[in-house]
Interface confidence: low
Amino acid sequence: GWVWNQFFVPEEMNTTSHHIGQLRSDLDNGNNSFQYKLLGAGAGSTFIIDERTGDIYAIQKLDREERSLYILRAQVIDIATGRAVEPESEFVIKVSDINDNEPKFLDEPYEAIVPEMSPEGTLVIQVTASDADDPSSGNNARLLYSLLQGQPYFSVEPTTGVIRISSKMDRELQDEYWVIIQAKDMIGQPGALSGTTSVLIKLSDVNDNKPIFKESLYRLTVSESAPTGTSIGTIMAYDNDIGENAEMDYSIEEDDSQTFDIITNHETQEGIVILKKKVDFEHQNHYGIRAKVKNHHVPEQLMKYHTEASTTFIKIQVEDVDEP
C-alpha cells in the first residue's frame, strides 16, 4: 500500500525547491525499479516529484491566502512491466500559514455621535479589523485593539474593539474628537503586524448651559402716548448650547407697577418688552423692572445646570408728550 505522512508546505518560502515529504509504495525495495508520477492541478508547475524516490518538492512560492489546499494524485508504476504497482491515490498538500497579513479595518471611515457629558463607560462604537491569516494557526490572526490617540477621554476594549467614554466631555469646549485605534495580530507578541483606523467622534448637544443675559442693565424709553401692547425694546440672552437646547423664555421677575410684560420671539430668541398699561409722564416718569430668562426645554436630569435663572435690570424712561 501507499505510505505517506500529512503534507504541509509553509507559504511564502523563498527557496527554489522546498522538500515537502515523500510518498512511496511499501513494495518499493529501493532498487529503482519503480517510477512515481504526480498528476492534477499544480503537478509539474507548482509541485514536482522525484520519479525514483517519491520525494515531493514545491518549486514555487505559495500564498495560503490565495490557495490553502492542493489535491493531487499519485501513481507508481513498475518500470519493467509498465503496470501500476498501487491503485492511483489522491492526496492533499496543505499550505501552512505564516503571519504575512496585517489586520485591516474594512468598514472605514468610522464616525459616531455621542451626547456630551455622557458618563464613563458609555458605549460609543465598535471597530472591527480582519486578518487574512489563518485563525486556526497559532496567533497569526488573533487581534488586540489599543488606543493610539484619544486618551484620556476614550478607551477601547482590547479584545472586542468596543470604544467607550472614559472621561466626561463638554461639547462647548470641543465638539469632535479624532480617535486612532490600532489592531495588532499575534496578540501583540514579537513579530506582530498592525493596522490602524481613525474614528471621528462627534459630541451632540445636551442642555448643560443656562441662558445668560448679555447685559446686566438695559435702558429703554417709552412715550407716554404709546398705546398698550406697544413694543418698547428688546433684551437678549445668550446660550452656549445649540438648537432647541438654546431656546429660551423671558419673563418679568419684578415689576411692582405691573405696567410691563415680556414676550419671547422664538425666531430670534430675543425678549420683547411690551407696554401692558398706559404710562403718564406727570404721574411717573421712570420705572425699574427685573427680567429673567430660562430655557424652554430642560430635562429633569439636567436641572442641576439651571439653578438660579439669569436676571437683568431694565430701566425705562417715560418721554413727555405735549398734551393739548
Epitope: 458618563p119 464613563e120 486618551q151 484620556p152 477621554y153 472621561s167 466626561k168 466631555m169 463638554d170 462647548e172 469646549l173 470641543q174 465638539d175 474628537y177 448651559n209 452656549n240 445646570y305
Partner: antibody, heavy 116, light 111 residues
C-alpha cells in the same frame, strides 16, 4: 508642532484697555478652544476665558464684565481685551490651547504692567 | 483663595519620593472632572505634566505619576532630581463657574 506667541504692549495705563494677540502656528485655529490665562508676579495661575473656534466664548465670572476674547481665523489669531485695568491686572499673560479639559500647548507669556 | 487647595511647598533630597496633594470639592474633582498637573520651571511658561488624572504626555519621564480619588488628587515624583525644582499646579473644571480652576501652586525644593 503647535506653537503660540503672545504679542501686545507691555505697559498699560490704569483705566485703559489691555489688548493682546496670540498667533497660532503649526496648526489651524479652526478647531479646538483657545484660552487666556494670567499669573500676577509671584502668584498662581488664573484662567481668564476661552473662545471656541465657532466663536462662542466663556469667561471667568470674576472678570466677565471687563473681558472680551475674539478670533481672527484668517490670520490664525485670537485676541484678549481687558477694560478698565488697575494695578491688580499686572501679570504675565499666557495664551493656551485647550484639549477638552486641559491646556496642552502654551505661549511663552508676556508681562503686562499697569502703571501711569 | 484658590478653588483647589495645594500645600505651598514641599521638599526632598535627590533620589527621594515626594507627593503633592490637590484637594477640591463636589463641584469640581468630586463631580468626575479630571485633574491635570503642570510644571513651571523658573522664568518659563507652565508645561503639561499629567493629564486626565494619570496620563503622561510624550517626553515626560515615568518618574512623574498622578492619581485621583474622590474629591482630591495627588502628584508623585520618584527619584527626585535637581531639575525637578519648580512650581507645580493642579487644574480641574469647576461646574459652578463653567470654567477652569487652578490650585494655588506648590514650590518643590530639591535639598
Amino acid at each position: 508642532q503647535v506653537q503660540l506667541q503672545e504679542s501686545g504692549p507691555g505697559l498699560v495705563k490704569p483705566s485703559e484697555t489691555l489688548s493682546l494677540t496670540c498667533t497660532v502656528s503649526g496648526g489651524s485655529i479652526s478647531s479646538y478652544s483657545w484660552s487666556w490665562i494670567r499669573q500676577p508676579p509671584g502668584k498662581g495661575l488664573e484662567w481668564i476665558g476661552y473662545i471656541y473656534y465657532s466663536g462662542s466664548t466663556n469667561y471667568n465670572p470674576s472678570l466677565k464684565s471687563r473681558v472680551t476674547i475674539s478670533l481672527d481665523t484668517s490670520k490664525n489669531q485670537f485676541s484678549l481685551k481687558l477694560s478698565s485695568v488697575t494695578a491688580a491686572d499686572t501679570a504675565v499673560y499666557y495664551c493656551a490651547r485647550n484639549w477638552a479639559f486641559h491646556f496642552d500647548y502654551w505661549g511663552q507669556g508676556t508681562l503686562v504692567t499697569v502703571s501711569s | 483663595q484658590s478653588v483647589l487647595t495645594q500645600p505651598p511647598s514641599v521638599s526632598g533630597a535627590p533620589g527621594q519620593r515626594v507627593t503633592i496633594s490637590c484637594t477640591g470639592s463636589s463641584s469640581n474633582i468630586g463631580t468626575g472632572y479630571d485633574v491635570h498637573w503642570y510644571q513651571q520651571l523658573p522664568g518659563t511658561a507652565p508645561k503639561l505634566l499629567i493629564y486626565g488624572n494619570s496620563n503622561r504626555p510624550s517626553g515626560v519621564p515615568d518618574r512623574f505619576s498622578g492619581s485621583k480619588s474622590g474629591t482630591s488628587a495627588s502628584l508623585a515624583i520618584t527619584g527626585l532630581q535637581a531639575e525637578d525644582e519648580a512650581d507645580y499646579y493642579c487644574q480641574s473644571y469647576e461646574s459652578s463657574l463653567s470654567g477652569w480652576v487652578f490650585g494655588g501652586g506648590t514650590r518643590l525644593t530639591v535639598l
